[in-house]
């Protein structure tokens, strides 16, 4: 079952997700998607990073923490009831079936 996070309409929502880079600046690709994590990657991607930077994002979704240190927690700005649901954070650690995936449930009141 998913860990539940709450936010109020009009506020910012925070969905935590972290990993420890093998070395400072040695980043791994991360994707955030609306909906549970599929078998690979993310569905309905709202934001993604590559080995260097945030390389895809949609409006209202951003990383507030220091993603270069592995803080890839998602902030959703000015939430509405439509933002309720499951979100997937997938950390794509290189190798054979090494992904770490987290399904987080956002409840908007």
């Amino acid at each position: 079952s998913e860990v539940e996070y709450r936010a109020e309409v009009g506020q910012n929502a925070y969905l935590p997700c972290f990993y420890t880079p093998a070395a400072p600046g040695n980043l791994v690709p991360v994707c955030w998607g609306k909906g549970a994590c599929p078998v690979f990657e993310c569905g309905n991607v709202v934001l993604r990073t590559d080995e260097r930077d945030v390389n895809y994002w949609t409006s209202r979704y951003w990383l507030n923490g220091d993603f270069r240190k592995g803080d890839v927690s998602l902030t959703i700005e000015n939430v509405t009831l439509a933002d309720s649901g499951i979100y997937c954070c997938r950390i794509q650690i290189p190798g054979i079936m090494n992904d770490e995936k987290f399904n987080l449930k956002l409840v908007i009141k």
């Epitope: 690709p29 998607g33 909906g35 549970a36 599929p38 078998v39 690979f40 990657e41 993310c42 569905g43 309905n44 991607v45 993604r48 895809y56 794509q92 650690i93 290189p94 190798g95 054979i96 079936m97 090494n98 992904d99």
Partner: antibody
Framework: EVMLMESGGGLVKLGGSLKLSCAAS????????MSWVRQTPEKRLEWVAT????????YYLDSVKDRFTISRDNAKNTLYLQMSSLNSEDTAVYYC??????????????WGQGTSVTVSS | SIVMTQTPKFMSTSVGDRVSVTCKAS??????VAWYQQKPGQSPKPLIY???TRHTGVPARFTGSGSGTDFTLTISNVQSEDLAEYFC?????????FGAGTKLELK
């Protein structure tokens, strides 16, 4: 036009090895995940392996993970499947397929024509 | 592994009919279901992803529905070119798995 062309199939002895290739054209190969899927003589489809666009992340079916190796050469627009310790269960038509992922993961939106692998005792 | 139980195995139809194929997942798969069409001697062709979204170029007579564990592919106004085998697949969790197929034949 998107094209995927498999090659390298054939008749191989039990315990033998084979390397399949899939030449891609008509799209930016390095921007897609790629997969191998096989179809048994009974027409059942079975996912075999998937590789990320950069080649950094790899996923296998449990029954092949110690025997098969998926790889790609983005400079040559080519996907590979190295198969070893082949057994009768590996007899199938092997398809390569393209997996879009960037804004939404979608499995196998284009398939090649397939290459046949027959394992004989 | 998630088992996709597809029914029926065979279906006889006439041009103009409406037919439905169902797939039942052994575990919850959200809407991570795709449908493929395979004509004899050809490779599979994608029809539907995310349970209900048609791929580009797929005629509107093909409709996917369902979520959770129960999914349906409906072909309304069947055409002769629709005579083929249809497969569902789940892509919710590893390994990605397919149904055993439904062969659509002419009566």
């Amino acid at each position: 036009e998107v094209m995927l062309m498999e090659s390298g199939g054939g008749l191989v002895k039990l315990g033998g090895s084979l390397k399949l290739s899939c030449a891609a054209s008509g799209f930016t190969f390095s921007s897609y995940y790629m997969s191998w899927v096989r179809q048994t003589p009974e027409k059942r489809l079975e996912w075999v392996a998937t590789i990320s666009n950069s080649g950094g992340s790899i996923y296998y079916l449990d029954s092949v993970k110690d025997r098969f190796t998926i790889s790609r050469d983005n400079a040559k627009n080519t996907l590979y499947l190295q198969m070893s310790s082949l057994n009768s269960e590996d007899t199938a038509v092997y398809y390569c397929a393209r997996d879009p992922y960037y804004s939404n993961y979608v499995p196998m939106d284009y398939w090649g024509q397939g290459t046949s692998v027959t394992v004989s005792s | 592994s998630i088992v996709m139980t597809q029914t029926p195995k065979f279906m006889s139809t006439s041009v103009g009919d409406r037919v439905s194929v169902t797939c039942k997942a052994s575990q919850y798969v959200d809407t991570y279901v795709a449908w493929y069409q395979q004509k004899p001697g050809q490779s599979p062709k994608p029809l539907i992803y995310s349970a209900s979204t048609r791929h580009t170029g797929v005629p509107a007579r093909f409709t996917g529905s369902g979520s959770g564990t129960d999914f349906t592919l409906t072909i309304s106004n069947v055409q002769s070119e629709d005579l083929a085998e249809y497969f569902c697949a789940q892509y919710s969790s590893s390994p990605l798995t397919f149904g055993a197929g439904t062969k659509l034949e002419l009566k």
